[in-house]
């Protein structure tokens, strides 16, 4: 039945980029400017998306495909097909419902999006703080306090990184 119907329906022959024009005896007419049809057999063309304001054009609309938008600098995409633009914050900040806020003491964010995360607690791994944390950077953990006993060099390189769950040899 599906095959029969397609044989009888002249619109099924209209390719992408055209529409089946009922006003012109179901002739396949090209999509008007600023519209598209991405599949064959369509009776109307869809209006092209316009990337305005904070949205900028990533891909121009063609007769067979819609325009694609992304966000201008200072914003990043959210939602399917970049339906929304959310503002970036500076490093050392997080985006809240009321805008960008500085990271609280003891937390950091090294990116322009996302939330502030707590500094690493070096003592949990038996290490000491080598470099203090900031709003933009995590602390750097150094050797354990025992390794820094009098007479020991304070510039010894930290032990090689080991996988979690593995004990030192």
């Amino acid at each position: 039945f599906e095959r029969t119907r397609s044989l009888q329906d002249p619109c099924s022959n209209c390719p992408a980029g055209t529409f089946c024009d009922n006003n012109r005896n179901q002739i396949c007419s090209p999509c008007p400017p600023n519209s598209f049809s991405s599949a064959g057999g369509q009776r109307t063309c869809d209006i092209c998306r316009q990337c305005k304001g904070v949205f900028r054009t990533r891909k121009e609309c063609s007769s067979t495909s819609n325009a694609e938008c992304d966000c201008t600098p200072g914003f990043h995409c959210l939602g399917a097909g970049c339906s929304m633009c959310e503002q970036d914050c500076k490093q050392g900040q997080e985006l809240t419902k009321k805008g960008c806020k500085d990271c609280c003491f003891g937390t950091f964010n090294d990116q322009k999006r996302g939330i502030c995360r707590p500094w690493t607690n070096c003592s949990l791994d038996g290490k000491s703080v080598l470099v203090n944390g900031t709003k933009e950077r995590d602390v750097v953990c150094g050797p354990s306090p025992a390794d820094l006993s009098p007479g020991a060099s304070s510039v010894t390189p930290p032990a090689p990184a080991r996988e979690p769950g593995h004990s030192p040899q």
Partner: nanobody, 124 residues
Framework: EVQLLESGGGLVQPGGSLRLSCAAS????????MTWVRQPPGKGLEWVSS????????YYADSVKGRFTISRDNSKNTLYLQMNSLRAEDTAVYYC?????????????????WGQGTTVTVSS
Amino acid sequence: EVQLLESGGGLVQPGGSLRLSCAASGFTFSNYAMTWVRQPPGKGLEWVSSISGSGGSTYYADSVKGRFTISRDNSKNTLYLQMNSLRAEDTAVYYCAKEGTGTTSDYYYNVDVWGQGTTVTVSS
């Protein structure tokens, strides 16, 4: 599949009112806080209001406080935004969003699902 479908947008004169609705499906609605955000033309997202899963706690952006009211009907799986005394600066696409937990605040977004949006135009 989790879905949020907004409705109720349109053209309204300054000083007028509109009521937006958001029909939710695909999850236990009463277990999650919900949020309205908006995107004015040419600008970024702006948080409008949030409500806890039970409806007992509500939060508003300063720009809409006293004019907008968020509410929910958990028996109908629907979120509402009553907008009164509308101003030209309220013109935007309004999005309904599901938060990741039942509680909410005026701080973190914590949004994991967005609707498609409904357009509100305030103009004389």
